[in-house]
């Protein structure tokens, strides 16, 4: 069956700062979708070899790509703190398939210690695939910040 | 399953305007690209726009670009089509359709879902 493998699991990066992520599958793809879990998931961009990728308003200027649909790089830049979240590569092949997700916290330069990425993936890669008639792995498993340690307050 | 349903369609004067409704039956709307296609008199079926599951992407046929305009209200099951300054050659029979696996670009690859079609016709 497809794959898609996707990453990285997760990144921790300051507001203004680039991100990228890799979405890789075994061939046979139509097309891929970058898409952003949340209570109202947004679609990102969508990249098919040979044609003008589609990106969403709020992403345009600050996106790249580079390899081809089946290795695809996205390039997110001059981030913002509203850009956190979940991102997961979404293939079209004859059905939708998955890719783990990558959880992107952007941070104010001085909270960098706060949230960061432990090597667990992201909550939404433990999902089973999403049934038939379901766009995206439920939303609220795929929660956008960890919360802060207790003690993570500032003297 | 889905079912979609064109109204909308009319008789308009070059220049006019018009706009499109297609209206799906089922709880998982949101689940489906959504795309409208068209085809003339004698013609094959053609490609017109697309819209993406929660709406932010958007793609259009060089032909219709920057006149048409796709939108979606999940909330009502309802995809629509603005269509601004016509012309004699859009006279067509439009067409909506759904697809859970669908690309952005100009096919219809993975719509498994088929309007009955509105007729569109521009006098000059």
């Known amino acids: 069956a497809q794959e898609v493998q996707q990453s990285p699991h997760c990144t921790t990066v300051p507001v203004g700062a680039s991100v990228n992520i890799t979405c890789s599958t075994s061939g046979g793809l139509r097309g891929i979708y970058l898409r952003q879990l949340g209570p109202q998931p947004q679609d990102i961009i969508y990249y098919e070899d040979g044609v003008v990728p589609t990106t969403d308003r709020r992403f345009r200027g600050r996106i790249d790509f580079s390899g081809s649909q089946d290795n695809l790089t996205i390039t997110m830049h001059r981030l913002q703190l509203s850009d956190t979240g979940t991102y997961t590569c979404q293939a079209i092949t004859e059905v939708n398939v998955y890719g783990s997700g990558t959880l992107v916290l952007v941070t104010e330069e001085q909270s960098q210690g706060w949230h960061r990425c432990s090597d667990a993936p992201p909550r939404a890669s433990a999902l089973p695939a999403p049934p038939t008639g379901s766009a995206l792995p439920d939303p609220q498993t795929a929660s956008a910040l960890p919360d802060p340690p207790a003690a993570s307050a500032l003297p | 399953q889905v079912q979609l349903q064109e109204s909308g369609g009319g008789l308009v004067q070059a220049g006019g305007s018009l706009r499109l409704s297609c209206a799906a039956s089922?709880?998982?709307?949101?689940?489906?690209?959504m795309k409208w296609f068209r085809q003339a008199p004698g013609k094959g079926r053609e490609f017109v726009a697309g819209?993406?599951?929660?709406?932010?992407?958007?793609s259009y046929s060089d032909s219709v670009k920057g006149r048409f305009t796709i939108s979606r209200d999940n909330a009502k099951n309802t995809v629509y089509l603005q269509m601004n300054s016509l012309k004699p050659e859009d006279t067509a029979v439009y067409y909506c359709?759904?697809?859970?696996?669908?690309?952005?670009?100009?096919?219809?690859?993975?719509?498994?879902?088929w309007g009955k079609g509105t007729q569109v016709t521009v006098s000059s």
């Open positions: 359709a759904a697809g859970e696996a669908a690309t952005m670009s100009d096919t219809d690859y993975g719509m498994d879902y």
């Open positions: 089922g709880r998982t709307f949101s689940s489906y690209v």
């Open positions: 819209i993406s599951w929660s709406g932010s992407l958007t």
